[in-house]
């Protein structure tokens, strides 16, 4: 009876592991055996392929091959018992783009309102993606095991820090893969499950900011307690997407270690251009606080993002405030080309009772204004980039009366 | 393979100073911490300091603040840790290991004993 | 700086015993808790990191839990390589520090 070839055979590559798996033609013929042949493009010969030869089952692993995986290469197979079918030829296909990215590897750190989630591929030094280990993102899956709401986090890299969560719960997650650059998404990892701990007795500092004074960088942070020590750490941003290395070498800011105060000055020498994070931690000589959640700082807009200019044309009922470019030093306008979004705080001065407008233009009028009044405004900038939200310091106050009575046009 | 290959035992004289060497190979130094530890005869294990070999950063522990030294030699892939104004509470075995990733201690060296006897 | 202390000190026990040891934690470190094993006349060799994470060769006898401030090591089944004296360290805060140490000895 002439044997029939296999049918149907797929090829599965999951990062560097090639995996085949067809249909028996003809499930009553027992014994059967079967191989296969590769051709690599360009080439007339077959050559066998180790590891899928005299197979029993219907899956074989083709892993050890050392393959180009961006040339195309041609599968056949056939069924042998006391004589054999003929080839059945598989359709040709480039490895790189049959591989699917396969689960991640996840470790997690539990603080009290914080879990570390440091990603790692799945197949350390993989071939497949060895001229993409830098392109890896990451999204994941997050949910409180009592509840089972999903929250999706999308476009992280290998260490993320999730932040705002509660003491003393169990939270659930799961990571995925991706590179954007060849339309690639990966497989989900295997649940993690970590519980936070209980909360802290100190809890981290908060809402840092950096502004620019001068030559120096002026770091500001609120915190619940008086009489502690800070300290202020910093690392460069593009550390987090390094594949694999999970040491992240923090550094200190010199200027910013065991200051008592809730703000801290060093010098704008102290960053070369990039772009950096910055954290915060609080100590009271006993205990000490988690780290703060991680601020990112952008040398290039921090520098050149500086207090507005204003003038204020008074009327008896309003102000009409004129917003200009910023003066560097020399009285020379600073361009700044990306969009802005100002906020103007305004006060009676004898009152302490702040109000604010949010303007994306250029002249704004603030309404409903006493005559006869001394008010102040002062205003900053804020860039329009939700990734990279900064904000300029404030202007000095500019204090103004309002005109008499009907006086408003 | 990671391998921390560390200087012989040391007799020094109370008020003297040591200095004990580290030689790492399978990795690359500047890629991680370098630490030290020691352990009195007996006792249990005491975090003396690290070093950051890529850029010389180091973090003491107050205990040794202002006698203990940690330098590196990246071009030859060894750390060194210099102990001064010993005394005989000093005498211990100092390790000095790796900081990998999650800041672990993951690979040691032999140990060195430091004997301070006059 | 923060106190690690592990009960208890001594702690004997029998070829296939499940023995657990303690460490507590003078404040909150999160899970940045490490277990080392050591042997006479050797250098400590690394058990568990991040309190629950096994290293790699390490038999799965060998477990660890806990977190905030309390902290365990678990084995399951004692084997005879496993009488040595295994330590806690936190790694949180600097300085780092280990607890005094636990030792594991035949009964």
């Known amino acids: 009876k002439n044997l029939k070839s296999p049918q149907k055979v797929e090829v599965d590559i999951i990062d560097d592991n090639f995996i085949l798996r067809w249909n028996r033609s003809d499930e009553s013929v027992g014994n059967v055996t079967f191989s296969f042949d590769y051709q690599k493009t360009g080439m007339d010969n077959w050559i066998k392929l180790s590891g899928c030869q005299n197979i029993t089952s219907t899956k074989c692993n083709f892993s050890s091959l050392k393959l180009n995986v961006y040339e195309e290469i041609k599968l056949r197979i056939r069924a042998e018992k006391e004589n054999t079918s003929s080839w059945y030829e598989v359709d040709s296909f480039t490895p790189f783009r049959k591989a699917q990215i396969g689960p991640p590897e996840v470790h997690l750190e539990a603080e009290d309102k914080a879990i570390v989630i440091h990603i790692s591929p799945g197949t350390k030094d993989s071939v497949m993606w060895a001229l993409d280990g830098l392109s890896f993102t990451y999204s994941l899956v997050i949910w409180k095991n009592s509840s089972g709401v999903e929250e999706r986090i999308e476009n992280i890299y290998s260490r993320h820090k999730i932040y705002k969560l509660s003491p003393e719960t169990t939270y659930c997650l799961k990571v995925k893969a991706a590179l954007l650059t060849s339309w690639k998404i990966g497989v989900y990892s295997p649940v993690h499950c970590i519980k936070t701990t209980v909360e802290n007795e100190l809890p981290p500092p908060e809402n840092i900011e950096v502004s620019v004074q001068n030559q120096n960088y002026v770091l500001k942070w609120d915190y619940t307690y008086a009489n502690m020590t800070f300290q202020v750490q910093w690392l460069h941003a593009f550390l987090k997407r390094n594949p694999g290395n999970h040491l992240y070498k923090w550094k200190q800011i010199p200027d910013c270690e065991n200051v008592k105060t809730t703000q801290c000055v060093f010098p704008q020498n102290v960053f070369q251009k990039g772009i950096y994070l910055l954290r915060v931690q609080a100590s009271d000589g006993n205990n000490t606080s988690f780290w703060s959640e991680e601020i990112k700082f952008d040398t290039e807009i921090q520098a050149f993002l500086l207090p507005p200019v204003f003038n204020i044309r008074s009327l008896s009922d309003s102000f009409h405030i004129y917003i200009g470019a910023p003066k560097q030093s020399g009285n020379t306008p600073v361009i700044q080309d990306y969009p802005l979004i100002y906020e103007i705080i305004f006060w009676e001065n004898t009152s302490n009772a702040e109000r604010k407008i949010i303007e994306k233009k250029t002249d704004v009028t603030v309404p409903n204004l006493k005559p006869l009044t001394v008010y102040c405004v002062k205003a900053r900038a804020h860039t329009m980039d939700e990734k990279l939200n900064k904000s300029s310091v404030f202007s000095d106050a500019v204090c103004e009366k309002t005109k008499p009575g009907n006086t408003s046009k | 393979q990671v391998q921390l290959v560390q200087s012989g035992a040391e007799v020094v004289k109370p008020g003297a100073s040591v200095k004990v060497s580290c030689k790492g190979s399978?990795?690359?130094?500047?890629?991680?911490?370098m630490h030290w530890v020691r352990q009195a005869p007996g006792q249990g294990l005491e975090w003396i300091g690290r070093?950051?070999?890529?850029?010389?950063?180091?973090k003491y522990a107050p205990k040794f603040q202002g006698r203990v030294t940690m330098t590196a030699d990246t071009s030859t892939s060894t750390v060194y840790m210099e102990l001064s104004s010993l005394r005989s509470e000093d005498t211990a075995v100092y390790y000095c290991?790796?900081?990998?990733?999650?800041?672990?201690?993951?690979?040691w060296g032999q140990g060195t004993l430091v004997t301070v006897s006059s | 700086d923060i106190q690690l202390t592990q009960s208890p000190s001594f702690l004997s026990a029998s070829v296939g015993d499940r023995v657990t040891i303690t460490c507590k934690a003078s404040?909150?470190?999160?899970?940045?808790v490490v277990w080392y094993q050591q042997k006479p006349g050797k250098a400590p060799k690394l058990l568990i990191y991040s309190a629950s994470y096994r290293v790699s060769g390490v038999p799965s006898r060998f477990s660890g839990s806990g977190s905030g401030t309390e902290f365990t090591l678990t084995i399951s089944s004692l084997q005879p390589e496993d009488f040595a004296t295994y330590y806690c360290?936190?790694?949180?805060?600097?300085?780092?520090?280990f607890g005094q140490g636990t030792k594991l000895e035949i009964k």
């Open positions: 360290q936190q790694k949180n805060n600097y300085p780092y520090t």
């Open positions: 070093i950051d070999p890529e850029d010389a950063e180091t």
């Open positions: 404040q909150n470190v999160g899970t940045n």
């Open positions: 290991a790796r900081g990998g990733n999650f800041y672990v201690m993951d690979y």
């Open positions: 399978g990795f690359n130094i500047k890629d991680y911490y």
